[in-house]
């Protein structure tokens, strides 16, 4: 132990410690609960949750979605391909979660918690996928201009964007949860 430091070990008790899979599962459910809290405010504030004009706004967004080729569905399940897709998708969602940060009045803290807990989830998954090189990180410049574009939208589109981000993120996490439980 270096000088000026003191080290104390913590030993595990007889109870089973959390495994990587259990902790990732809990982290996703934590984020999903956070999304539910944010959606509650969004739906109370506007009628976006019942709107039929979603397709209009959805064209402007390139939100990550699970597809057959990603190997995350039961038919054609592929652990490696799927894990890459989950991590890549979460990294792509980060810019949208950044956009959400100024979109909530009474749930500002929850929006921050969703953003931070997603960063933690990415770290947990990257540890699990340490041998995978196929993970591409989004370009910061592209993200910055996307953020500017989203923030420049009119109020109605901003409300719709917020609603769509939360809904898509929820669907993506639910698909990820199902897939990870098969790994």
């Amino acid at each position: 132990v270096p000088p000026g430091e003191d080290s104390k070990d913590v030993a595990a008790p007889h109870r089973q410690p959390l495994t990587s899979s259990e902790r990732i599962d809990k982290q996703i459910r934590y984020i999903l609960d956070g999304i539910s809290a944010l959606r509650k405010e969004t739906c109370n504030k506007s009628n976006m949750c019942e709107s039929s004009k979603e397709a209009l706004a959805e064209n402007n967004l390139n939100l990550p979605k699970m597809a057959e080729k990603d190997g995350c569905f039961q038919s054609g399940f592929n652990e490696e391909t799927c894990l890459v897709k989950i991590i890549t998708g979460l990294l792509e969602f980060e810019v949208y979660l950044e956009y959400l940060q100024n979109r909530f009045e009474s749930s500002e803290e929850q929006a921050r918690a969703v953003q931070m807990s997603t960063k933690v989830l990415i770290q947990f998954l990257q540890k699990k996928a340490k041998n995978l090189d196929a993970i591409t990180t989004p370009d910061p410049t592209t993200n910055a201009s996307l953020l500017t574009k989203l923030q420049a939208q009119n109020q109605w589109l901003q409300d719709m964007t917020t609603h769509l981000i939360l809904r898509s993120f929820k669907e993506f996490l639910q698909s990820s949860l199902r897939a990870l439980r098969q790994m």
Epitope: V10, A11, A12, P13, R15, P17, L18, S20, R23, K26, Q27, Y30, I31, D33, G34, A37, Q110, R112, A113, M116, S117, K119, V120, Q123, F124
Partner: nanobody, 124 residues
């Protein structure tokens, strides 16, 4: 055990875990001064990395983690004689429910694992 430090000095406590991954747990640092009740000094959530500091240590103490070393730290600066006591770290699942209250981390009943403690004495 810990160490004897002069007032105004610094000390870094480290807490390494064996048999489980510290990253998966909320972390707490506690201390017990002679003849006083155990006090929660600082905590860090594993879910969203939120931190908590007792008023008495705010601005002087910093909690951190090192995933690669499976270790957590408490950096203590500008130490005062009233910081004297036995310090120990703990790990628990108090932070796994969305909307948890960070201040609950100071309850030692919230923890599954606990270090054996180290004596810190601040005196000239």
């Amino acid at each position: 055990g810990g160490g004897l430090v002069q007032p105004g000095g610094s000390l870094r406590l480290s807490c390494a875990a064996s048999g489980f991954t510290l990253d998966y747990y909320g972390i707490g640092w506690f201390r017990q001064a002679p003849g006083k009740e155990r006090e929660g000094v600082s905590c860090m959530s594993s879910s969203d990395l939120k931190t908590y500091y007792a008023d008495s240590v705010k601005g002087r103490f910093t909690i951190s983690r090192d995933s690669a070393k499976n270790t957590v730290y408490l950096q203590m600066n500008s130490l005062k004689p009233e910081d004297t006591g036995v310090y120990y770290c703990a790990a628990g699942t108090w932070d796994l429910k969305f909307g948890y209250n960070i201040t609950t981390c100071v309850r030692s009943s919230e923890y599954d694992y606990r270090g054996q403690g180290t004596q810190v004495t601040v005196s000239s």
